[in-house]
């Protein structure tokens, strides 16, 4: 650690005195302190001399000697008082700038330690300090306002009692800056804008911050716009607003608009897109296939996306048949707005019934006209099967009718014994009918097919089964020839006797 001569913590001299402060260290040493007049520095290897032959009150202060090469950063200090009867204060700063909740040191240094008992801090023109101002005093450093608040940004003076009267220092302006958490908060409205050529438009860019020192501007396609700024202060925040008003928009006004705000903490920006169109538009689309197939009893949501400007004047869902004149219940129709110009309309069809298959149309209207988007809904059914014994052209024939959607495939099985359903062990013969005859195939209805199995003679201890299947499920019908006649066995518990 460097050593200072004279080896006293404080030195009191009179104005005009010669002061010599010598610092000696192991390596080179440096003097530091408040930049002030009349000092001369002389360095000679491991010592440095700070001297003046005409000390003034302005030389009052703490002088520190350091050894730059010392890794421990040791230093020594001496405080010099130049006690001027006419100047009790040496003010080291015209202005002190701190952040809120920091301690603010007002650096009025007492030039005579004897005066310490009679010091006080006041605001300029003798005004008292604001309530709750918590401060302390050090003759070496000055007055410290603890945990300074923004409201304490004032002009202060230090007061000392000299011969029964108060002597004031020059004033010190305290600037307490609000702690800025980050760049200003921004809003740019609207988030998106569409106008028809010739219409009016407004874009508002606003920024706010706890500190007044910030800039905000609006730019169009990277060109800064010259717009007058409105300023305001409310909710303890400074607000700056830029409003772009366009009476009659044209295509050159279209494009990207960015609202940009910056302060010492950085920059924030947000953007929007302005579209200028020739005329009103209305576009309907769906992410779904317009041809829908759903199993009977299940539910379906039909969704339509609408892009429109100007806004919709009307919209509705309509059932176009073919089964009944029922219309979708309004409570099942749902509208959600994604943003100003895009909406989603949903029709919920829970637990679909056979009569609800058909065409559903969404219609929408705006000043640009009306548009419709139609879905075709076909219901899927598992096959229903029935078998009868008949003679065709004199030949005994088993006739199997299967009805379902999609179109069922038909397989005939012959098995031993009398059974409701042939199992693998009993099967004697299997016939696939690749091309059953289609009896009916109307849109939105089941498809009915017919398959014929010509049997020369019915074996009485055997069962003939017609099986039909499609993507939804399968159905079957067992036919049991008996001496009194033929018996047929429908699936499950049903028994049919012709």
């Amino acid at each position: 650690i460097p050593v200072i001569e004279p080896s006293v913590p404080e030195l009191v001299v009179k104005p005009g005195a010669t002061v010599t402060l010598r610092c000696v260290g192991n390596g080179s040493v440096e003097w530091d302190g408040p930049p002030s007049p009349h000092w001369t520095l002389y360095s000679d290897g491991s010592s440095s001399i700070l001297s003046t032959n005409n000390a003034t009150f302005q030389n009052t202060g703490t002088y520190r000697c350091t050894e730059p090469g010392d890794p421990l950063g040791g230093s020594a200090a001496i405080h010099l008082y130049v006690k001027d009867p006419a100047r009790p204060w040496n003010v080291l700063a015209q202005e002190v700038v701190v952040f809120e909740d920091q301690d603010a040191l007002l650096p009025c240094l007492l030039t005579d330690p004897v005066l310490e008992a009679g010091v006080s801090l006041v605001r300029v023109r003798g005004r008292p300090l604001m309530r709750h101002t918590n401060y302390s005093f050090s003759p070496w450093h000055g007055f410290t306002i603890h945990r300074a608040k923004f409201i304490q940004s004032q002009d202060y003076q230090c007061s000392a009692l000299m011969g029964g009267r108060k002597v004031m220092s020059i004033s010190i302006r305290l600037k307490v800056q609000k702690v800025i958490p980050g760049p200003p908060a921004l809003t740019l409205v609207p988030a998106e804008l569409v106008r028809i050529r010739g219409e009016a438009a407004q874009i508002v860019c606003s920024a706010s911050s706890v500190d007044v020192n910030f800039d905000v501007f609006l730019q169009h396609n990277n060109t800064k716009l010259a717009i007058p700024q409105q300023s305001d202060f409310h909710n303890n925040r400074y607000q700056k607003v830029l409003t772009l008003n366009l009476d009659q928009v044209d295509f050159q006004h279209a494009g990207n608009y960015s609202c940009v705000a910056s302060n010492v903490q950085g920059k924030h920006s947000t953007s929007m897109f302005f579209r200028v169109v020739e005329s009103a538009y209305l576009n309907l689309s769906s992410e779904q296939n317009l041809i829908q197939e759903v199993t009977v009893g299940e539910g379906l949501n039909l969704k339509v996306m609408v892009e429109a400007y100007p806004g919709l004047q009307g919209f509705n869902w309509t059932y176009l048949g073919p089964f009944s004149d029922h219309q979708p219940e309004p409570k099942l129709a749902n509208a959600t707005t994604k943003d100003t110009y895009r909406h989603t309309f949903t029709l919920s069809l829970p637990r679909l019934k056979p009569s609800e298959a058909g065409r559903y149309s969404f219609l929408a209207r705006n000043p640009g006209g009306w548009r419709a988007l139609t879905f075709e809904l076909t219901l899927r059914y598992p096959p229903e099967v029935s078998v009868i014994w008949t003679f065709i052209n004199g030949s005994g024939t088993l006739l199997c009718a299967a009805s379902g959607y999609p179109q069922p495939n038909v397989t005939w099985l012959q098995c031993s014994g009398h059974t409701d359903r042939c199992d693998e062990a009993q099967v004697l013969q299997v016939w696939d009918d690749p091309y059953p005859e289609v009896l009916s195939q109307e849109p939105f209805h089941k498809v009915t097919v017919q398959s014929l199995l010509t049997v020369e003679t019915l074996e009485h201890n055997q069962t003939y089964e017609c099986r039909a299947h499609n993507s939804v499920g399968s159905g079957s019908w067992a036919f049991i020839p008996i001496s009194a006649g033929a018996h047929t066995h429908p699936p499950d518990e049903f028994l049919f006797t012709p």
Epitope: H38, W39, L41, N54, L105, P107
Partner: antibody, heavy 117, light 110 residues
Framework: QVQLQESGPGLVKPSETLSLTCTVS??????YYWSWIRQPAGKGLEWI?????????NYNPSLKSRVTMSVDTSKNLFSLKLSSVTAADTAVYYC???????????WAQGTLVTVSS | QSVLTQPPSASGTPGQRVTISCSGS????????VNWYQQLPGTAPKLLIY???QRPSGVPDRFSGSKSGTSASLAISGLQSEDEADYYC???????????FGGGTKLTVL
């Protein structure tokens, strides 16, 4: 070795505020005085003002009404704001460390600030 | 208009001794110490002399400073081509409560 680096916009519009920041590296900002100096093209140097790490500031009287300096010891940086700028404020701006007798031992490389619309 | 007065230019040939003067008043040079800075083209000023005649480490002893009354001077002996630069004097000014500078002297090595 102490190093100083200025940052801030190189172009400022008339009547707006010039803002510069000086970041100190290779040493602590604490317990030293830090100054701003400027130099118009082809001209001499002009001291703008100084700030101590406690927030004490002294400004050149000719600029005092327009200058604000601040310091952030946690980030080892100090800042200059010069308001209501005109073309006469176009200059290379330097930040530097000021010592006891008013000399500057460390300087930044300087940043040119042009005031123009 | 600078507070301290310097000649705008000076010149010399390699090996020569050149002196640059700086004139002030009682509120600056008369009562305070003088500092000198060298500014090479396109660079920041560099401290050359502080407190009238003190050289920071790394500055050759060819550079020396002196002060008398309200004037100061910088002497460069054994002039070298790399000494071609602008030189500025500076001193604390009591009325400014800060440093003032001279207008600078452009030194040309012929």
């Amino acid at each position: 070795q102490v190093q100083l680096q200025e940052s801030g916009p190189g172009l400022v519009k008339p009547s707006e505020t010039l803002s510069l920041t000086c970041t100190v590296s290779g040493g602590s900002i604490n317990s030293y005085y830090w100054s701003w100096i400027r130099q118009p093209a082809g001209k001499g140097l002009e001291w703008i003002g100084r700030i101590y790490t406690s927030g004490n500031t002294n400004y050149n009287p000719s600029l005092k009404s327009r200058v604000t300096m601040s310091v952030d010891t946690s980030k080892n940086l100090f800042s200059l704001k010069l308001s209501s700028v005109t073309a006469a404020d176009t200059a290379v701006y330097y930040c530097a460390r000021e010592r006891l007798t008013g000399y500057f031992d460390y300087w930044a490389q300087g940043t040119l600030v042009t005031v123009s619309s | 208009q600078s507070v301290l007065t310097q000649p705008p230019s000076a010149s010399g040939t390699p090996g020569q001794r050149v002196t640059i003067s700086c004139s002030g008043s009682s509120s600056n040079i008369g009562s305070n110490t003088v500092n000198w800075y060298q500014q090479l083209p396109g660079t920041a000023p560099k401290l050359l002399i502080y407190s009238n005649n003190q050289r920071p480490s790394g500055v050759p002893d060819r550079f020396s400073g002196s002060k008398s009354g309200t004037s100061a001077s910088l002497a460069i002996s054994g002039l070298q081509s790399e000494d071609e630069a602008d030189y500025y004097c500076a001193a604390w000014d009591d009325s400014l409560n800060g440093p003032v500078f001279g207008g600078g002297t452009k030194l040309t090595v012929l």
